[in-house]
């Protein structure tokens, strides 16, 4: 008799998930020699241990602690770039500006970026059919808890001036329900972080509005100010030119507003 399997609303575990995590770990340690002490097989075992045989709606941050310990990494605390709903541009930026780091430039973020995973209670199987959706099923699912855990730790580590890239094309430029709005903002440490500087990325070619005046940005400013952290905001009117000027800052066209 075929065993009954829970059907969740979200997509199932990414195919080749174990192979992908292990391969990414090996790649990361090749690319970042300072992380060569990491044993990738142990990392995979800890990752697997966080969700295998556990109910995928009952995952806790505690489940991920062995993985967090193995993936402990020091990034320059004053070179952190947070982002919300504009991941690709943030990653393009840190690819050029090599001394700045998004969460996905760290080992743990790199391992899990764009992947989905979950297990099943009391079986050692990975569920490739479906996984819980944050809204429709439950918030304490393996993927959401992982990102909440690593995002919190990343924000807690930040110091001095922290930058955040925000998507000016969205109706809510700052969204309180995003990982940035619900986790990272609240875990910046006022005793370490002096300023949060928001970069609002414009989508339209002819969009010359000052999106730093947007009501949601004002809401972000209010939250940050209440936490005794200074806030500043810049419009990035031309993201393509912005990246080009990061690559070639001496270009004569890079002195004007981007």
């Amino acid at each position: 008799v075929p065993r009954w399997r829970q059907q969740w609303s979200g997509p199932g575990t990414t195919k080749r998930f174990p192979e992908t995590v292990l391969a990414r770990c090996v790649k990361y340690t090749e690319i970042h020699p300072e992380m060569r002490h990491v044993d990738c097989q142990s990392v995979w075992d800890a990752f697997k241990g966080a969700f295998i045989s556990k109910h995928p709606c009952n995952i806790t941050e505690e489940d991920y602690q062995p993985l967090m310990k193995l993936g402990t990494q020091t990034v320059p605390c004053n070179k952190i770039l947070l982002w919300s709903r504009i991941k690709d541009l943030a990653h393009q930026f840190t690819q050029v500006q090599r001394d700045m780091f998004t969460l996905e430039d760290t080992l743990l973020g790199y391992l899990a970026d764009d992947l989905t995973w979950c297990g099943e209670f009391n079986t050692s199987k990975i569920n490739y059919q479906s996984c819980p959706d944050w809204r429709k099923d439950c918030s304490n699912n393996p993927v959401s808890v992982f990102w909440k855990t690593v995002s919190r730790r990343f924000a807690e580590a930040a110091c001095d001036v922290v930058h955040v890239m925000l998507n000016g094309s969205r109706s809510k430029i700052f969204d309180k329900n995003s990982t940035f709005g619900s986790v990272e903002v609240h875990n910046l440490q006022p005793e370490k972080v002096q300023t949060l500087e928001a970069w609002v990325i414009h989508g339209g070619r002819e969009d010359s509005r000052d999106l730093c005046q947007d009501p949601t940005i004002k809401e972000l400013e209010s939250i940050i100010s209440k936490r005794n952290i200074q806030f500043s905001c810049k419009n990035i009117y031309r993201p393509d030119k912005f990246l080009q000027c990061v690559k070639n800052p001496e270009d004569s066209s890079c002195t004007s507003e981007i």
Epitope: R16, E19, A23, V26, E30, I31, P33, R36, Q95
Partner: antibody
């Protein structure tokens, strides 16, 4: 069986650009970093740079920055190394190479090499 | 960049001889040194990784040792098919750097 097959020999004029390909098989292309290595005739080996095909991230040795572009096409499992503003001293054999799971960070897998001759 | 100084640049030995090549790194590279064999017109072939580990299928006459800055590669009993150029490479820090090579010939 892991295989890295490179494009054929090229003869170019000074100032031109050459683009060498490295098509892989026998493993998942995005699972490994691809490296490029230069070897002048009768001389030693020099690491040029790498690409992570999964994310398109690259790193190029300082000596080659500004002239070398490394790219990857995941739809065809092919890595590319483009060298621009060619000069006679770029005459060399160019290899693609990658690490393996049981080889530390050494390169057990190499392409057969592509000879580039720069001559007017 | 880390310099890898390899010596000798060439050597001539008889079949059955013990052959030793050294590589000195300009700074500590832990045990992240690999040794390659290259025959004319061919791609390099990995023999030793992480200073002392023989890669799969490599004959036991090839060995490596060392850590930090001083590394040694040994062929315990030279065979005719070992005629080649041998290179060390440090894989500890970007950019990876190679030694200048040692050409091994038979007397």
């Amino acid at each position: 069986e892991v295989q890295l097959v490179q494009s054929g020999a090229e003869v170019k004029k000074p100032g031109a650009t050459v683009k060498i390909s490295c098509k892989v098989s026998g493993y998942t292309f995005t699972d490994s970093v691809m490296n490029w290595v230069q070897q002048h005739p009768g001389k030693g080996l020099e690491w040029m740079g790498w690409i992570d095909p999964e994310y398109g991230r690259t790193d190029v040795a300082e000596k080659f920055q500004g002239r070398v572009t490394i790219t990857a096409d995941t739809s065809t499992d092919t890595a590319y190394m483009e060298l621009s503003s060619l000069r006679s001293e770029d005459t060399a054999v160019y290899y693609c190479a990658r690490t393996g799971y049981q080889s530390g960070y050494g390169f057990p897998y190499w392409g057969q090499g592509t000879t580039v001759t720069v001559s007017s | 960049d880390i310099q890898m100084t390899q010596s000798p640049s060439s050597l001539s030995a008889s079949v059955g001889d013990r052959v030793t090549i050294t590589c000195k790194a300009s700074q500590n590279v832990d045990s992240d040194v690999d040794w390659y064999q290259q025959k004319p017109g061919k791609a390099p072939k990995l023999l030793i990784y992480k200073a002392s580990n023989r890669y799969t299928g490599v004959p036991s006459r090839f060995s490596g040792s060392g850590s930090g800055t001083d590394f040694t590669f040994t062929i315990s009993s030279l065979q005719p098919e070992d005629i080649a150029t041998y290179y060390c490479m440090q894989s500890n820090t970007h950019p990876r750097t190679f030694g200048g090579g040692t050409k091994v010939e038979i007397k």
